[in-house]
Amino acid sequence: HTAAQDNCTCPTNKMTVCSPDGPGGRCQCRALGSGVAVDCSTLTSKCLLLKARMSAPKNARTLVRPNEHALVDNDGLYDPDCDPEGRFKARQCNQTSVCWCVNSVGVRRTDKGDLSLRCDELVRTHHILIDLRHRPTAGAFNHSDLDAELRRLFRERYRLHPKFVAAVHYEQPTIQIELRQNTSQKAAGDVDIGDAAYYFERDVKGESLFQGRGGLDLRVRGEPLQVERTLIYYLDEIPPKFSMKRLTGGGSGGGSHHHHHHHHHH
């Protein structure tokens, strides 16, 4: 796999161990936690990144109203099971044999069950809504400039094909970025919208996954854009299956967290 030959590092994933033991002495990088060889010319899958993160030492509106089936990742971090291609396995279980089904971005889409729980297929997240609030700025952002800059960012930094950035909405101070990618649209070699969204999420939290780069500096006509809060909604090709108890506000006692629907407060 391609990597920086001179010092043998992975430009797109700092959570790797690299050595010149590939074919012909080429640099090869493996993800921490899983040991899976990664392609350093593109983004690493979210599943492998989460696994690596868990293995690391612990130290009148133009805005979109999220669909009623939108999921928000409130469960936080877990150590996922990934398939040989680095995708999330449809069923995830923890050490106490509690299991649940996830979508292609690894977000829980069913109630938790036991080892008898069946997850027949990995359901694809085909629509991601990234909802940001930016910090007050000295100069206002022009919508079309902001749109162009965010599209450039996803194209250049995250290598996401422009056709998958469906829309950029702006109603100061809220910015919404809509990513859409159906199974049929995603060709071999295309970056997955879930992976691009995860890299972006880590960037705006000041936790860049890229090797050796400083934090993300995002400017619109020279004016820096600083993000105060981020909320990401995930929409699956097949709606999630949660019990009615959960949908009516139950099931979140005892300190457990759920992927609440959009009308819950976060």
């Epitope: 000295a138 000041g206 934090g215 006509r221 020279g222 820096p224 854009l225 600083q226 993000v227």
Partner: antibody, heavy 122, light 106 residues
Framework: QVQLVQSGAEVKKPGASVKVSCKAS????????INWVRQRPGQGLEWMGW????????KYNEKFKGRVTMTVDTSTSTVYMELSSLRSEDTAVYYC???????????????WGQGTLVTVSS | EIVLTQSPATLSLSPGERATLSCSAS?????IYWYQRKPGQAPRLLIY???NLASGIPARFSGSGSGTDYTLTISSLEPEDFAVYYC?????????FGQGTKVEIK
């Protein structure tokens, strides 16, 4: 390390123009804006404007609009500040300073050039 | 424009003493930046985003505040801390600085 080096002192007559340069090194020149701030004798600091080398975007203090022009030469990593129609009250030390920022923080003006004294006298 | 008023204009203290410098904004700002200037030198950034210490700045410097009232504190003055201190806002254009507080040796 990041460094800004300014051109030398200038003496100008009222009505003339002055062009001060600021050469940057030690970082990716196009990645942050360069601001100009002046300090008149016995006075405080006064912001004049900034220029963003990546796309040439500029923001000027209205007080200096029409008199100040900021330009950039990316081939030499140099920014220029030209002030025209000089008057005696423009006598000041002129500083350039870079501002780094990320989506998380605005890191303020750091570092600053050593300053250029511009004296306007007939 | 946002006017920043610093107080006191002059602070006379001895080495080892605690210095508290105030910066009051004419309208609410989100963040304040603090700079130190010594005679014949360029200003130096001390604090960014109200409370974050700039690179290489000793931990005796700290910043706090919100809205219209901000503070720079030097917990124990060292001889090299005697200088003029300026606050600055980045909330609206034009960017403005306070008139400065001079910290002098008593």
């Amino acid at each position: 390390q990041v460094q800004l080096v300014q051109s030398g002192a200038e003496v100008k007559k009222p009505g003339a123009s002055v062009k001060v340069s600021c050469k940057a090194s030690g970082y990716t020149f196009t990645s942050s804006d360069i601001n100009w701030v002046r300090q008149r004798p016995g006075q405080g600091l006064e912001w004049m404007g900034w220029i963003y080398p990546r796309d040439g975007s500029k923001k000027y203090n209205e007080k200096f609009k029409g008199r100040v022009t900021m330009t950039v030469d990316t081939s030499t990593s140099t920014v220029y500040m030209e002030l025209s129609s000089l008057r005696s009250e423009d006598t000041a030390v002129y500083y350039c300073a870079t501002r780094f920022a990320t989506v998380v923080s605005n890191y303020g003006l750091d570092p600053w050039g050593q300053g250029t004294l511009v004296t306007v006298s007939s | 424009e946002i006017v920043l008023t610093q107080s006191p204009a002059t602070l006379s203290l001895s080495p080892g003493e605690r210095a508290t410098l105030s910066c009051s904004a004419s309208s609410s700002v989100n963040y304040i930046y603090w700079y130190q200037r010594k005679p014949g030198q360029a200003p130096r950034l001390l604090i960014y985003d109200t409370s974050n210490l700039a690179s290489g700045i000793p931990a005796r410097f700290s910043g706090s505040g919100s809205g219209t009232d901000y503070t720079l504190t030097i917990s124990s003055l060292e001889p090299e801390d005697f200088a003029v201190y300026y606050c600055q806002q980045w909330n609206s254009y034009p960017l403005t600085f306070g008139q400065g507080t001079k910290v002098e040796i008593k």
